[in-house]
């Protein structure tokens, strides 16, 4: 490889292009890397990561979560139902990812990257889904008022909300990745 050239780029023409499933898989892993980086800043900044008061704040957040009925677990696995749940869940997370945008100092770009990568992931998954009619898009007005409400919280609650969003999004993506690998 010539100096200064990346061997991956040189080999690229001989590499098989990624399949749709591989692209989705890689995208989820990329987002999870981003979430982990954001959590480092959150945990360094406050003691939220060790907090046992999570349950209190969690009650006020309606964060998407995988349940048995969603068809993503192996017992009762249903590819179409599960795919709809993953897309719907990601669309519901978008307002929370918007909330995160002003929550980071040194990781501002990382927060933006997580948000934009999630939009791309949704597009990848929508191409894969056959039953797009079953996907309900969150109401913009409801999202706007939720955003205002979250931003009006005191500092402690905002820190806790940030922590909970990142943790829940991570778990949702992990569940999604396990399910997508079964498809």
């Amino acid at each position: 490889v010539p100096p200064g050239e990346d061997s991956k780029d040189v080999a690229a023409p001989h590499r098989q292009p990624l399949t749709s499933s591989e692209r989705i898989d890689k995208q989820i892993r990329y987002i999870l890397d981003g979430i982990s980086a954001l959590r480092k800043e959150t945990c360094n900044k406050s003691n939220m990561c060790e907090s046992s008061k999570e349950a209190l704040a969690e009650n006020n957040l309606n964060l998407p979560k995988m349940a048995e009925k969603d068809g993503c677990f192996q017992s009762g696995f249903n590819e179409e139902t599960c795919l709809v749940k993953i897309i719907t869940g990601l669309l519901e997370f978008e307002v929370y990812l918007e909330y995160l945008q002003n929550r980071f100092e040194s990781s501002e770009e990382q927060a933006r990257a997580v948000q934009m990568s999630t939009k791309v992931l949704i597009q990848f998954l929508q191409k894969k889904a056959k039953n797009l009619d079953a996907i309900t898009t969150p109401d913009p007005t409801t999202n706007a008022s939720l955003l205002t409400k979250l931003q009006a919280q005191n500092q402690w609650l905002q820190d806790m909300t940030t922590h909970l969003i990142l943790r829940s999004f991570k778990e949702f993506l992990q569940s999604s990745l396990r399910a997508l690998r079964q498809m």
Partner: antibody, heavy 127, light 111 residues
Framework: EVQLQESGPGLVKPSQTLSLTCTVS??????????WSWIRQPPGKGLEWMGV???????YYKPSLKSRTSISRDTSKNQFSLQLSSVTPEDTAVYYC???????????????????WGKGTLVTVSS | QAVLTQPPSMSGTLGKTLTISCNGT?????????VSWYQQLPGTTPKLLIE???TRVSGIPDRFSGSKSDNTASLTISGLQSEDEATYYC??????????FGGGTHLTVLG
């Protein structure tokens, strides 16, 4: 070479809290996507997974032990700890700490493969 | 009470092949390629042999192999040797965010 070493009291009274610490050497618990687990083995019996703390500091516990178990970490000391409250003689066991997280485990949240183990420490619950 | 079911004991003959089964459900073994196998020699710490159902860990001889069919995982030991006499445990990821072990199989190697 990663090495793990459990430490803590060998005797705990019933109803008290069992506290164990695992010190990791040969690698930092704060780098790379590994997770850190606790497993126990009652005398003459099989292995029982108790819980795990992952790279981000998130904890997951065996459902039947969840109300009594707490796992935490201290990255500055390269240690992670187990606390088990309201112990009974049935909690008498050899307690192992172990590293998990091979391959894609972090991305999948599947910490089922433990590649490095401590030697184990026997904890007896008795008055 | 272990969640995954293994035969408590088995015996095999030197040089022969033996397979240990590990039965679970669609929530654990059936949920993906998330099965591992451990060997515990008497009085020692468990040692990881196999992860990801079939992947042998570095340094483990190729006499040990893993497989899975539906909700059952298997560990096959070919060319049995006297040093294989140990207790073998299977483990699996279990939905959600959980790990379960089998009860263990004590293997006796007969001359």
């Amino acid at each position: 070479e990663v090495q793990l070493q459990e430490s803590g009291p060998g005797l705990v009274k019933p109803s008290q809290t069992l506290s164990l610490t695992c010190t990791v050497s040969g690698g930092s618990i704060a780098t790379s996507y590994y997770a850190w687990s606790w497993i126990r083995q009652p005398p003459g019996k099989g292995l029982e997974w108790m819980g795990v703390i992952d790279y981000d500091g998130d904890t997951y516990y065996k459902p039947s032990l969840k109300s009594r178990t707490s796992i935490s970490r201290d990255t500055s000391k390269n240690q992670f700890s187990l606390q088990l409250s309201s112990v009974t003689p049935e909690d008498t066991a050899v307690y192992y700490c172990a590293r998990a997280g091979l391959g894609d485990s972090y991305y999948l949240g599947t910490y089922y493969a433990m590649d490095y183990w401590g030697k184990g420490t026997l904890v007896t619950v008795s008055s | 009470q272990a969640v995954l079911t293994q035969p408590p004991s088995m015996s095999g003959t030197l040089g022969k092949t033996l397979t240990i089964s590990c039965n679970g459900t669609s929530s654990d073994i059936g949920s993906g390629n998330y099965v591992s196998w451990y060997q515990q020699l008497p009085g020692t710490t468990p040692k990881l042999l196999i992860e990801g159902v079939t992947t042998r860990v570095s340094g483990i001889p190729d006499r040990f192999s893993g497989s899975k069919s539906d909700n059952t995982a298997s560990l096959t030991i070919s060319g049995l040797q006297s040093e294989d006499e140990a207790t073998y445990y299977c483990a699996s990821y279990r939905e959600t965010n959980n790990v379960v072990f089998g009860g263990g199989t004590h293997l006796t190697v007969l001359g």
